[in-house]
Amino acid sequence: MGRARDAILDALENLTAEELKKFKLKLLSVPLREGYGRIPRGALLSMDALDLTDKLVSFYLETYGAELTANVLRDMGLQEMAGQLQAATHQGSGAAPAGIQAPPQSAAKPGLHFIDQHRAALIARVTNVEWLLDALYGKVLTDEQYQAVRAEPTNPSKMRKLFSFTPAWNWTCKDLLLQALRESQSYLVEDLERS
């Protein structure tokens, strides 16, 4: 993981300021695979190469993000750069075979917190729910909410109940949940981050 991201970044950092501007404009109109959204114009136009790389990877994941970048570069007449990008992403990278993509809903959205991005995976994979509840009690969760989550019979149903309260949370509340996850199931956070 990360090879495609690095290859995208290398390609974008090698563009002139004018070419990067052209790249962004083409990105606004390039045909997208079904189920994938477009990066908002306002955010897109102000980005540098690093931010744009992160946004491409968060919106389209690494494999499709690299493919999309290569398509835009080709469309700009930068065939050699597009070829180098695709070669770099397939060089023993263990990249997913063409046509096999992670579902688009797992891609990050701008301004979407880590716990919102990975809601489904967290519901399915968090096992240490009681520990999370104790960490959040009094800071983020009321006594009533704490008891409601604890009353659920299984870990997934506990997490689903916990997530039923998150729409009312602000960013810092979500950060406290993330901190608790880092402390109790660090390997899971790492794994989700790599995805």
């Epitope: 690093l50 931010d51 901190q179």
Partner: antibody
Framework: QVQLVQSGAEVKKPGSSVKVSCKIS????????IHWVRQAPGQGLEWMGY????????MYNEKFQGRVTITADKSTSTAYMELSSLRSEDTAVYYC???????????????WGQGTLVTVSS | EIVLTQSPATLSLSPGERATLSCHAS??????LSWYQQKPGQAPRLLIY???NLHTGIPARFSGSGSGTDFTLTISSLEPEDFAVYYC?????????FGQGTKLEIK
């Protein structure tokens, strides 16, 4: 490119307040957290807290709780850090910083302002 | 709060030598550690994040390793511009904290 430009140096009296600004450009202001870190002369770095301009929520280092207030003005893409009840030990360079990205599971500071020296002296 | 202790406080080496800087956390922080370089009158500069990931634009002579409570920043062959103060920072829990720094000076 991403830029964080801070306000100029300040000299303040003990007991007063200081408000330092950090003007952001080069990315969508509401998408990323902005943190404040200070450094006393010849000393190490100390995290003060952050704001998420998207919803205006802030988190503070408890050491400064009640004395520090971090705010953001979306209309000007500017973050502010106000420190009250100043004492001589608050003399430091105050930095605003932006993480590599905020939607990941951590905060590593890839972008920094140039720093603002605040001197507290009677 | 999590306390990060860096050692040594000062490291005196010559260009071309290998530098090894340590950072010890008071409790388990898994891999949530970064390293910064700071030169006089400048803001810190991110070198390594998540223990071992090299930040964009940082030369490959810098590398990071470790997990749990013990971490290392290695500079394989020192260049004149590498002499500076280095800080570690934990991202595991709030408040975020930094080590007290290691000053890397020319011998």
């Amino acid at each position: 490119q991403v830029q964080l430009v801070q306000s100029g140096a300040e000299v303040k009296k003990p007991g007063s307040s200081v408000k330092v600004s950090c003007k952001i450009s080069g990315y969508s202001f509401t998408d990323q957290t902005i943190h404040w870190v200070r450094q006393a002369p010849g000393q190490g770095l100390e995290w003060m807290g952050y704001i998420y301009p998207g919803d205006g929520s802030a988190m503070y280092n408890e050491k400064f709780q009640g004395r520090v207030t971090i705010t953001a003005d979306k209309s000007t893409s500017t973050a502010y850090m106000e420190l009250s009840s100043l004492r001589s030990e608050d003399t430091a360079v105050y930095y605003c910083a932006r993480p590599l990205y905020s939607y990941a599971s951590y905060y590593w500071f890839a972008y920094w302002g140039q720093g603002t020296l605040v001197t507290v002296s009677s | 709060e999590i306390v990060l202790t860096q050692s040594p406080a000062t490291l005196s080496l010559s260009p071309g030598e290998r530098a090894t800087l340590s950072c010890h956390a008071s409790q388990n922080i898994n891999v949530w550690l970064s390293w910064y370089q700071q030169k006089p009158g400048q803001a810190p500069r991110l070198l390594i994040y998540k223990s071992s990931n090299l930040h964009t634009g940082i030369p490959a002579r810098f590398s990071g390793s470790g997990s749990g409570t013990d971490f290392t920043l290695t500079i394989s062959s020192l260049e004149p511009e590498d002499f500076a103060v280095y800080y570690c920072q934990q991202g595991q829990s709030y408040p975020l904290t930094f080590g007290q720094g290691t000053k890397l000076e020319i011998k």
